[in-house]
């Protein structure tokens, strides 16, 4: 069956989400990064549950934590600066959950490093598109 | 490691059409998606049209019905047909290929820059 244009939309926003926190994940894992260690010591927020794109307001609320990560990594691998690509990143999620969203976020007891944090939702991303598909 | 190398840009007037390639240095899993991306002077990183291992193609609107993407896995190749070209559409093109699966491995080009201009 064709694809509906919303859900194509919805596939390339969620493409464009996946790029940005992709070349975030490169950046930080590569080997160059003398910075890794101590970014790793930062501590992120993780959700309880994410499988719908409300739930994207979890990562919304981790953004600014994350952003003064990467302001500490003054790599060159993320392409952009990072006030720069956490403002892409924040469009694309508003766009994805809709402003109108009152979702509260509910977030897992444990807590993540970076990297975790990045393949949480990497992985969430996949996941809906794949189901888009 | 894997390498990405684009070509094809070049100075073009309104209305041109361009075919930007992205060949790679290794083997890319046909199962990759790939795709362009584009980055105007001052201006945010723009997604333009990918393409999935399947052959899923998806374009961003202000591209759709001009540009095509398509990729040759036996020749580690992908392309962007760009046509009927608008001096909005000048900036440095980058192509891309990510894994779909842990660890999420992500791979780009250098660029190549596609100017429209009369």
């Known amino acids: 069956a064709p694809t509906s244009s919303s859900t194509k939309k919805t596939q390339l926003q969620l493409e464009h989400l996946l790029l940005d926190l992709q070349m975030i994940l490169n950046g930080i894992n590569n080997y160059k990064n003398p910075k890794l260690t101590r970014m790793l010591t930062f501590k992120f927020y993780m959700p309880k549950k994410a499988t719908e794109l409300k739930h994207l307001q979890c990562l919304e609320e981790e953004l600014k934590p994350l952003e003064e990560v990467l302001n500490l990594a003054q790599s060159k691998n993320f392409h952009l600066r990072p006030r720069d690509l956490i403002s892409n990143i924040n469009v694309i999620v508003l766009e994805l959950k809709g402003s109108e969203t009152t979702f509260m976020c509910e977030y897992a007891d444990e807590t993540a490093t970076i990297v975790e944090f990045l393949n949480r939702w990497i992985t969430f991303c996949q996941s809906i598109i794949s189901t888009l598909t | 490691e894997v390498q990405l190398l684009e070509s094809g840009g070049g100075l073009v007037q309104p209305g041109g059409s361009l075919r930007l390639s992205c060949a790679t240095s290794?083997?890319?899993?046909?199962?990759?998606?790939m795709g362009w991306y584009r980055q105007a002077p001052g201006k945010g990183r723009e997604l333009v049209a990918v393409i999935s291992g399947g052959g899923d193609t998806n374009y961003a609107d202000s591209v759709k019905g001009r540009f095509t993407i398509s990729r040759d896995n036996s020749k580690n190749t992908m392309y962007l047909q760009m046509n009927s070209l608008r001096a909005e559409d000048t900036a440095v093109y980058y192509c891309?290929?990510?894994?779909?699966?842990?660890?999420?491995?992500?791979?780009w080009g250098q660029g190549t820059l596609v100017t429209v201009s009369s």
């Open positions: 290794g083997t890319i899993f046909s199962g990759y998606t």
């Open positions: 891309y290929s990510r894994e779909v699966t842990p660890p999420w491995k992500l791979y």
